[in-house]
Interface confidence: medium
Amino acid sequence: ELCDDDPPEIPHATFKAMAYKEGTMLNCECKRGFRRIKSGSLYMLCTGNSSHSSWDNQCQCTSSATRNTTKQVTPQPEEQKERKTTEMQSPMQPVDQASLPGHCREPPPWENEATERIYHFVVGQMVYYQCVQGYRALHRGPAESVCKMTHGKTRWTQPQLICTGEMETSQFPGEEKPQASPEGRPESETSCLVTTTDFQIQTEMAATMETSIFTTEYQ
């Protein structure tokens, strides 16, 4: 089951997957001035059996005479209409990734591929967040997000990460010492819920993890 939307955006942070669940698709995108070869695949697909997972199909780009070739020329299949974009990541991965059953490694780059990779994640996929250079991570909990299915709908859990403008960068898992984080609801977010009767009140308040505001009115 494909995830319907993108992983959450965290100000001054980027995300990446350490491994990709079987069923994940990666668009075959080419950089400007290049396009997919005519008979080439639209996407790579992470497939596998109980013992081994790998990417099916290969992406191939060829020189293009036309200029507007940043995006695929062929329309994407309907189930691929939601796009998950991540920056190009280094193929270097934590050593334990290959042993994760049912997952594929980051596919190696192909010649003339686009600078951004567009993934189509599946339920159960986990992505990890880090603050961009120049920002420091404040962790309230795990700096990760998981695509979950709830009553037939998919959504991403909210990573408990805040990036502040101090000159110290956090690292991705496998590159940092593990941080203890308070156990809490896995998909909690800073949220507001205010209830009023008769009329609606717009309330500005500093929301904490426990703060809720649902505004209720009647007509």
Epitope: D4, D5, P8, K148, T150, H151, G152, K153, R155, W156, Q158, R185, E187, S188, E189, T190, S191, C192, L193, A207, T211, S212, I213, F214
Partner: antibody, heavy 104, light 106 residues
Framework: PGESLKISCKSS????????IGWVRQMPGKGLEWMGI????????RYSPSFQGQVTISADKSINTAYLQWSSLKASDSAMYYC??????????WGQGTLVTVSS | TQSPGTLSLSPGERATLSCRAS???????LAWYQQKPGQAPRLLIY???RRATGIPDRFSGSGSGTDFTLTISRLEPEDFAVYYC???????????FGQGTRLEIK
Amino acid sequence: PGESLKISCKSSGYSFNTYWIGWVRQMPGKGLEWMGIIYPSDSDTRYSPSFQGQVTISADKSINTAYLQWSSLKASDSAMYYCARDGGYYFDDWGQGTLVTVSS
Amino acid sequence: TQSPGTLSLSPGERATLSCRASQSVSSTYLAWYQQKPGQAPRLLIYGTSRRATGIPDRFSGSGSGTDFTLTISRLEPEDFAVYYCQQYNSSPLMYTFGQGTRLEIK
């Protein structure tokens, strides 16, 4: 009694469209009763059998608001009504409630 | 079914609240809430034993099958409230709350 009523629940601070929102009734001095849930993104709605046909749950995703509506109130509808965010198998954030009193 | 209906204890004591389901419930689908007078319920425990954000570690949940327990290891004055267990059923989709246990100061 007999009047219509629509109460609303405005959410902020999280991705409203990707969480189910539930409604829970609490009659005076009594316990909690689940009424139903709605998925604001596409207005998919599920009702408790006890409340099916008695109330209508709706949502307007453009203004992050869910609604609970009665077409004809009864005295037995007098209760506190809570909206709550559905965390999956439990409700992890609650509004402070709207008290509905039906009297002649 | 929650028992007892009312539990009278003193601050510092240990409280044990019981929740019994009519049929077996997956541990993933059992939650506990606290409600104080004039306030909305608050999630304490989900997945039988996982504490929600900001819940002190004196609250713990356990159990399996049809019998589940909420334990408050050492009662604080602010813990006196009504506690509800809640189970989830996926087909048909249904959230069922227990009738509540009132925890009062002895």
